[in-house]
C-alpha cells in the first residue's frame, strides 16, 4: 500500500480468482483514543471500533472511503483505491490501446518544434468518475524538470456503438535548448483513476523522435506564361524552430486529381517553391519534415489548381 | 514520381555536400545494423545513449547559431578551444567561433573514425561474420575530415590484446552508430547554417 496523495491510498493486488488479497491497517488521524467507530462509503454499518481498523482487501467491494467517527462526528477519511496486477502485468483497463506506432501504445506525444514543448494525448471509452494527473521529467535517475498542465477533454468521437473520449495535456521542459543533442529521454507518467481503480501509464521518448511540424503556410500558386505549369510557393510554419537555416525542413509537393484513384505526382525539394503541372480539378498539397532527422511529416497544406 | 533533391553546386560552402553524404551514410549503416542485429538490443529505446566526445569536444555549444546564444539553456559550457586553420573557412572574416566550431567537428570525426576502425578490426575476427562497417561510411568521414583540413595529432588506433567479446562489440556498435547519427545531424545543421550565412 502507498499514498497517492493526502488521505488517498493505493493497494496493489495480485488479481486472480480466490486470491488472498492484502491485509491493510488503517489508522484514524485523531488524538482521540476510544469511542472510535469505522464505516465504509455511505453505509452506516459499523465495520470495527478502535483507533486502527484491520481489513483484508481482495476485491473492489473492499475499496472505497473508510471513515472513522466519534459520537456522530467525522474524525478522518482514508480512500482506498485498487491497482490490479494480472500475472505480473499491471492492468490497463482505463485507456485504449492506440496501436500506433506499435501495440500497447496508450499515450501518444508530439512536438511542433525543438523548444521542449510537447503535447500528449490518450483515449478512453469511460465518460464519468474519471480523473487524470500527469507528471514528466527528463531522465529518471536524476530527473530534470518538465512542467505539465492539467489534462483536459480535447475531443469526443463516436466509434461504432461506443463513444470515445480524447484527453490531452501540454508539457514544457523547464530549461530546453533547441540545438541540444538529447541523451536522456523525456518520461511522461499519467495516473488514471476510474471510480476505485487506479492505473498508471508511462511513455518515454526523445523530442527529436516525436517532432511533427505544422503544415507549411501561405501556400500560393503562380501560373507560368504559355504553360500548363505553375510555380507553387510556401513558407515555413510559424511554429517551427528558428533559425530556419539551422533547423531546415524538406518538403513534399503532391498534385492529386479529384479522384483518389488518379496517379499522384510527387516532388521532393528543400526549397520553398517548386514548379509542377496543374491538371484541371486537381489540387496541390505540400507537407514538411525535418530535413536531417526523419521524424513525422506534417499534415498537408492544400490549394485547388483552378 | 520521386524527383531527387538537387546536389549543391561546387561554389557552395565546401563542407555542406560532404556533411550531407555523412548523414546519409551513417543513417544507412544504422538501418543495416538494426536489421542485421535484430536479436540484439539495437533500437533507440533499448540502448544506452553514450557520447564518446563528451567532455572532449563541445560541438553543440561551439557551433550554436547566433540566434540561440541568447538562450540561457544553450550556454552550458563554451570554454573548450581548438586549433583554427581549416579550409572550410570560406572567407577571412570568419569569426573565431566559427573556427572553433569547425575544429570541434573535426575532432568529433577523428574520435569516431578511430572507434569505428578499432571496432571493425574486432568484427572482422568474428567467426559469424555477421556485420562489418560500411567502407563508404568510413570513406565519407575521411572526405569530410580532409575538407575541414585541420592539422591535429593522429590518434593511434586502439589495439586490444584480450579476446573480443563479439556480443558486447555489436552492442557497442549500435550505441556508437546511434550517437554518431545524432552528431551527424548536428553537423549537417551547422553546415547548412554556415552556408546560409
Amino acid at each position: 500500500i502507498w499514498e497517492l496523495k493526502k488521505d488517498v491510498y493505493v493497494v496493489e493486488l495480485d488479481w486472480y480468482p480466490d486470491a488472498p488479497g492484502e491485509m491493510v491497517v488503517l489508522t484514524c488521524d485523531t488524538p482521540e483514543e476510544d469511542g472510535i467507530t469505522w464505516t465504509l462509503d455511505q453505509s452506516s454499518e459499523v465495520l470495527g471500533s478502535g483507533k486502527t481498523l484491520t481489513i483484508q482487501v481482495k476485491e473492489f467491494g473492499d475499496a472505497g472511503q473508510y471513515t472513522c467517527h466519534k459520537g456522530g462526528e467525522v474524525l478522518s477519511h482514508s480512500l482506498l483505491l485498487l491497482h490490479k496486477k494480472e500475472d505480473g502485468i499491471w492492468s490497463t483497463d482505463i485507456l485504449k490501446d492506440q496501436k500506433e506506432p506499435k501495440n500497447k501504445t496508450f499515450l501518444r506525444c508530439e512536438a511542433k518544434n525543438y523548444s521542449g514543448r510537447f503535447t500528449c494525448w490518450w483515449l478512453t471509452t469511460i465518460s464519468t468518475d474519471l480523473t487524470f494527473s500527469v507528471k514528466s521529467s527528463r531522465g529518471s535517475s536524476d530527473p530534470q524538470g518538465v512542467t505539465c498542465g492539467a489534462a483536459t477533454l480535447s475531443a469526443e468521437r463516436v466509434r461504432g456503438d461506443n463513444k470515445e473520449y480524447e484527453y490531452s495535456v501540454e508539457c514544457q521542459e523547464d530549461s530546453a535548448c533547441p540545438a541540444a543533442e538529447e541523451s536522456l529521454p523525456i518520461e511522461v507518467m499519467v495516473d488514471a483513476v476510474h471510480k476505485l481503480k487506479y492505473e498508471n501509464y508511462t511513455s518515454s521518448f526523445f523530442i527529436r523522435d516525436i517532432i511533427k511540424p505544422d503544415p507549411p503556410k501561405n501556400l500560393q500558386l503562380k501560373p507560368l506564361k504559355n504553360s500548363r505549369q505553375v510555380e507553387v510557393s510556401w513558407e515555413y510554419p510559424d511554429t517551427w524552430s528558428t533559425p530556419h537555416s539551422y533547423f531546415s525542413l524538406t518538403f513534399c509537393v503532391q498534385v492529386q486529381g479529384k479522384s483518389k484513384r488518379e496517379k499522384k505526382d510527387r516532388v521532393f525539394t528543400d526549397k520553398t517553391s517548386a514548379t509542377v503541372i496543374c491538371r484541371k480539378n486537381a489540387s496541390i498539397s505540400v507537407r514538411a519534415q525535418d530535413r536531417y532527422y526523419s521524424s513525422s511529416w506534417s499534415e498537408w497544406a492544400s490549394v485547388p489548381c483552378s | 514520381r520521386n524527383l531527387p533533391v538537387a546536389t549543391p553546386d561546387p561554389g557552395m560552402f565546401p563542407c555542406l555536400h560532404h556533411s550531407q553524404n555523412l548523414l546519409r551514410a551513417v543513417s544507412n549503416m544504422l538501418q543495416k545494423a538494426r536489421q542485421t542485429l535484430e536479436f540484439y538490443p539495437c533500437t533507440s529505446e533499448e540502448i544506452d545513449h553514450e557520447d564518446i566526445t563528451k567532455d572532449k569536444t563541445s560541438t553543440v555549444e561551439a557551433c550554436l547559431p547566433l540566434e540561440l546564444t541568447k538562450n540561457e539553456s544553450c550556454l552550458n559550457s563554451r570554454e573548450t578551444s581548438f586549433i583554427t586553420n581549416g579550409s572550410c573557412l570560406a572567407s577571412r572574416k570568419t569569426s573565431f567561433m566559427m573556427a572553433l566550431c569547425l575544429s570541434s567537428i573535426y575532432e568529433d570525426l577523428k574520435m569516431y573514425q578511430v572507434e569505428f576502425k578499432t571496432m571493425n578490426a574486432k568484427l572482422l575476427m568474428d567467426p559469424k561474420r555477421q556485420i562489418f562497417l560500411d567502407q563508404n561510411m568510413l570513406a565519407v568521414i575521411d572526405e569530410l575530415m580532409q575538407a575541414l583540413n585541420f592539422n591535429s595529432e593522429t590518434v593511434p588506433q586502439k589495439s586490444s590484446l584480450e579476446e573480443p567479446d563479439f556480443y558486447k562489440t555489436k552492442i557497442k556498435l549500435c550505441i556508437l552508430l546511434h550517437a554518431f547519427r545524432i552528431r551527424a545531424v548536428t553537423i549537417d545543421r551547422v553546415m547548412s547554417y554556415l552556408n546560409a550565412s
Epitope: 488479481w15 486472480y16 486470491a19 494480472e86 500475472d87 505480473g88 483497463d93 506499435k102 500497447k104 | -
Partner: antibody
Framework: QVQLVQSGGGVVQPGRSLRLSCAAS????????MHWVRQAPGKGLEWVAF????????YYADSVKGRFTISRDNSKNTLYLQMKSLRAEDTAVYYC????????WGQGTMVTVSS | SYVLTQPPSVSGTPGQRVTISCSGG????????VKWYQQLPGTAPKLLIY???QRPSGVPDRFSGSKSGTSASLAITGVQAEDEADYYC????????????FGTGTKVTVLG
C-alpha cells in the same frame, strides 16, 4: 472453491458451427479476464482467445480470427466460444481458463471436425 | 508458430535432477514473466510455477523455476515416477499481450 465446467463439444462437419460454454462458480466472474486454449490430439497447447472482465476487449489467435467469437454473460457467470466455418485443423480439446498469476482450468471439451 | 522453444524430451532416473529449458526473445521472456505447467495424460494442465520462480501452495518443493535474460528453466530435483508428464512453459509477448505464448512442450520420462 473456484470451478469451471465446460460443455458444448462434439462431432461436427467441416464448414459448420458449434458453441462451447464454460460455467463459472466460486468467484466473482465479472471481475476477471478469461481465455480459451486448445490442444490438438498429440500436440501442444495453443492459445485461442481472450476476453476482458467486462467484455470490452477481445483478442484472437490469427488461426481463428474472423471465424471464432469469444463472449461472456456476466449475469449468468458464463463464458462462450462461438466457432464458425470449422476446419479439420480445429479438432482439439478446448479448455477455458481464468487470467492471472494463479489460474484455474476447465475440464476440457473435445471438438472433432470431420466429414 | 511457437516462439518459446523447449527440448522435445528429457529423461532421468528416480532421484536425479532434471532440467527443462525454455528459450524465447527480448519481447517475450525478456520482458515478461514465465509460468510452468505439468500435464498428465487426459487431464487439464496444472500450474507448477508462476511469476518465474514462485510455487503455488500444494506444489512439491522439488519443482523450482528460474529466469535469466531471454530464457527460463524448470528444475525437478529428485525426480519421481509420478513426475512423468508433459511440461509447458508460458509467457507473453509485449506486443500481443494478453495472448498466451506457450512453449513447444517437453516430455519428461522417468527411467527404471
Amino acid at each position: 472453491q473456484v470451478q469451471l465446467v465446460q460443455s458444448g463439444g462434439g462431432v461436427v462437419q467441416p464448414g459448420r458451427s458449434l458453441r462451447l460454454s464454460c460455467a463459472a462458480s466460486g468467484f466473482t466472474f465479472s471481475s476477471y479476464g478469461m481465455h480459451w486454449v486448445r490442444q490438438a490430439p498429440g500436440k501442444g497447447l495453443e492459445w485461442v482467445a481472450f476476453i476482458r472482465y467486462d467484455g470490452s476487449n477481445k483478442y484472437y489467435a490469427d488461426s481463428v480470427k474472423g471465424r471464432f467469437t469469444i463472449s461472456r454473460d456476466n449475469s449468468k457467470n458464463t463464458l462462450y466460444l462461438q466457432m464458425k466455418s470449422l476446419r479439420a485443423e480445429d479438432t482439439a480439446v478446448y479448455y477455458c481458463k481464468t487470467h492471472g498469476s494463479h489460474d484455474n482450468w476447465g475440464q476440457g471439451t473435445m471438438v472433432t471436425v470431420s466429414s | 508458430s511457437y516462439v518459446l522453444t523447449q527440448p522435445p524430451s528429457v529423461s532421468g532416473t528416480p532421484g536425479q535432477r532434471v532440467t527443462i529449458s525454455c528459450s524465447g526473445g527480448r519481447s517475450n521472456i525478456g520482458s515478461n514473466t514465465v509460468k510452468w505447467y505439468q500435464q498428465l495424460p487426459g487431464t487439464a494442465p496444472k500450474l507448477l510455477i508462476y511469476l518465474n520462480d514462485q510455487r503455488p501452495s500444494g506444489v512439491p518443493d522439488r519443482f523450482s523455476g528460474s529466469k535469466s535474460g531471454t530464457s527460463a528453466s524448470l528444475a525437478i530435483t529428485g525426480v519421481q515416477a509420478e513426475d512423468e508428464a508433459d511440461y509447458y512453459c508460458q509467457s507473453y509477448d509485449r506486443g500481443t499481450h494478453p495472448a498466451l505464448l506457450f512453449g513447444t512442450g517437453t516430455k519428461v520420462t522417468v527411467l527404471g
